[in-house]
Structure formats: structure tokens, C-alpha cells
Amino acid sequence: FKVATPYSLYVCPEGQNVTLTCRLLGPVDKGHDVTFYKTWYRSSRGEVQTCSERRPIRNLTFQDLHLHHGGHQAANTSHDLAQRHGLESASDHHGNFSITMRNLTLLDSGLYCCLVVEIRHHHSEHRVHGAMELQVQTGKDAPSNCVVYPSSSQDSENITAA
């Protein structure tokens, strides 16, 4: 399976809300002993591998923001903790999963990563990730609403396969 990032860049005005999205592509094993762990975190474009380092999003770690379920089931994070920080991550039945960030500030600018771990109990974990940039702008040059820029189909950094 693969993870695709429909948009590689989000440019938003300060104070706006944004939903960053990843999509699970390809065949998904729905076997009894296969489960999925999905989460979000901030990172940097490291020399070794993009999305390797896991930094918190608004002080919430990837452990706090994770989703867990089998296959394409719907799920969302623990509401209380995330919503206190203006965050909510969710996934649907179609392989889409997202994180919504409310009331953006300049400090929210940076690289965001979604991580999917396919857990095959008794065998191994397969991890795939997607990366996208968020730019929060202020002042007269800032857009009135979020502007999104599609990922190029050749951008291997935004689609990784197990």
C-alpha cells in the first residue's frame, strides 16, 4: 500500500483553520491479525530521510494524536486533549485521514508528516509516511483563505510505499 498527499503545500492566513490530508492507496489487508496505526507529527527535511524526526504539534506528540483501527474503519483521536490544543485528527472509510488545526498562528508553519503503520502481528510492521508544508502568513500579502498546491505525481517524497 501507499500513502499519498493530495497537496504538498498549504498557504493560510493567520487565524484560519486548515485540514491537512493524507490518503491510503492500494490494497489494504483486512485480515484478523492486521491493524493500522495512523498518526501525525511535525518534522524537518532531514539529510537522511524526510519525516524521520518526530516533533510535537502544538505540544501534542505523535502518541497523543494517533488513530488505531483495522483497515478502512473510521476513527478519531481522543477529543479532549486534542481539542484543548485546537487539533483533531480523523480518518474515514475510504482511506482518507486528516488533521484539522484551528486558529492558525505563525508558529504553526513547518513540515507536517502523516504516518501509517500496517501491523502484521507475528510478522512485522510496515510503515509509510507522507509530508506536506504549511505556511502561515500575516499582513497584506496573506491570502484571505487557505490556498492549497497539489503534489506532483512524480514527487516521491510525498508518496512512499511499503
Epitope: D33, T35, Y37, V48, Q49, S52, R54, F62, Q63, H66, H68, G70, S78, L115, V117, I119, H121, H122, H123, S124, E125, R127
Partner: antibody, heavy 117, light 107 residues
């Protein structure tokens, strides 16, 4: 802050079953892998197995025939049973939280179990 | 199962010196390797995940490197509290395995 605490008898007779419980406090047990790891005196660490929040288990093949790990989410506890113990099973037993695609990030303080008649 | 071999078994150094610990895997583990520190009577503590990323709260003097089968944990300048046993651990597949450990002792 999630904390783990092992409990159970410190002395078990040969051929009997070792039973330990790990209590998870300060967080939810309904996610992650919940693992048992042991360390014989003066030796290294050995992963025994885990139970996933969904109930799926995975055991070290070297111990699989003797190990059972179970979970009681209502009590925020998971348990280890190791049957037919011998002196070679004498060790400090740790419970730990293992994050998928990450590491053992939280450990109990460990409990010493001696197998002796 | 994947066997992790750590060397040296014991490293005798003085505070302020640089410590270089090695972990070699019997087959490639990509970069799915963690390092732990264990002091006497205590549980292990996570230092490094995914070969080179420091866990939360770990001082910058600890660094990890390597991929595939050869990995290194470096302590740039040993502090008194760094004298302990260090273990590597792979998670590319199960069973999860640990190295035999390297003891860093005061010279």
C-alpha cells in the same frame, strides 16, 4: 503521565506457573503494544511478547509454548503467565509500553522473580 | 531472528572523554534501531529511536548514526551520570531483539 507498575509473587517453584500483572495508570490502555521483557541477573534484555489493544498477541518463539499474555481493559491491566518454569526463568520482569514503529518508551520499575524450590 | 552484537563489551573511560559504542545486526534492519541506557537497579531508558533521533529530554551529547547492519551510539563528552549499560534494539521484524549490551565504566 503514563506509569506502569508490575506486581506478583517474587518466588515461584520449578514446574509451576509464573503470573505477573502490570497496571497502567495515567493514560489509556486501549492503544499501543503492551509488552513483557525480562532480564536474568547480570545479563541482557529478552523480549517475551506483547498484547495489542485489539487483543492480538505476539510471543517470542523461544518462549511461545509457555507464554500467555492477556489484557483487562476495564482494570487497565495486562498480565503475563509463564508455565513450567525452571531456574533459567529467574529474572527481573519488566512491563513496557511499545509504540508502533517507535520504541519501548515507558517501562515499569521491574519485579524480581526467583524460581526455586 | 535478528542477532545484534554490541562491542566492546566494556568501555573504560574518564568523564569528559568521548564514548563510541557499536551495534552490528546479523541482517539489515534499515534504520529501525533504538538505543537504551540502563543504570543499576533501574529500568532501561529510551535514548535514540530510528537510529539517529534523540528521544524527548535526551541531551544533545548523545547521538546515533548508521543504517543497514552497522550502527553507532556516540556520547560526545561523558558526564558522571552517563556511566551505565547501553543496549541496542531492532524493530524491523519480530521477535524484537536486543544486543548484549556495552558497559561504560569509569576508568
Amino acid at each position: 503521565q503514563v506509569q506502569l507498575q508490575e506486581s506478583g509473587p517474587g518466588l515461584v517453584k520449578p514446574s509451576e506457573t509464573l503470573s505477573l500483572t502490570c497496571t497502567v495508570s495515567g493514560g489509556s490502555i486501549s492503544s499501543y503494544y503492551w509488552s513483557w521483557i525480562r532480564q536474568p541477573p547480570g545479563k541482557g534484555l529478552e523480549w517475551i511478547g506483547y498484547i495489542y489493544h485489539s487483543g492480538s498477541t505476539n510471543y517470542n518463539p523461544s518462549l511461545k509454548s509457555r507464554v500467555t499474555i492477556s489484557v483487562d481493559t476495564s482494570k487497565s491491566q495486562f498480565s503475563l503467565k509463564l508455565s513450567s518454569v525452571t531456574a533459567a526463568d529467574t529474572a527481573v520482569y519488566y512491563c513496557a509500553r511499545d509504540i508502533p514503529a517507535f520504541a519501548f518508551d515507558i517501562w515499569g520499575q521491574g519485579t524480581m522473580v526467583i524460581v526455586s524450590s | 531472528e535478528i542477532v545484534l552484537t554490541q562491542s566492546p563489551a566494556t568501555l573504560s573511560l574518564s568523564p569528559g572523554e568521548r564514548a563510541t559504542l557499536s551495534c552490528r545486526a546479523s541482517q539489515s534492519v534499515s534504520y529501525y534501531l533504538a538505543w537504551y541506557q540502563q543504570k543499576p537497579g533501574q529500568a532501561p531508558r529510551l535514548l535514540i529511536y530510528d537510529a539517529f533521533n534523540r528521544a524527548t529530554g535526551i541531551p544533545a551529547r548523545f547521538s546515533g548514526s548508521g543504517s543497514g547492519t552497522d550502527f553507532t551510539l556516540t556520547i560526545s563528552s561523558l558526564e558522571p551520570e552517563d556511566f551505565a549499560v547501553y543496549y541496542c534494539q531492532q524493530r524491523i521484524n519480530w521477535p524484537l531483539t536486543f544486543g548484549g549490551g556495552t558497559k561504560v565504566e569509569i576508568k
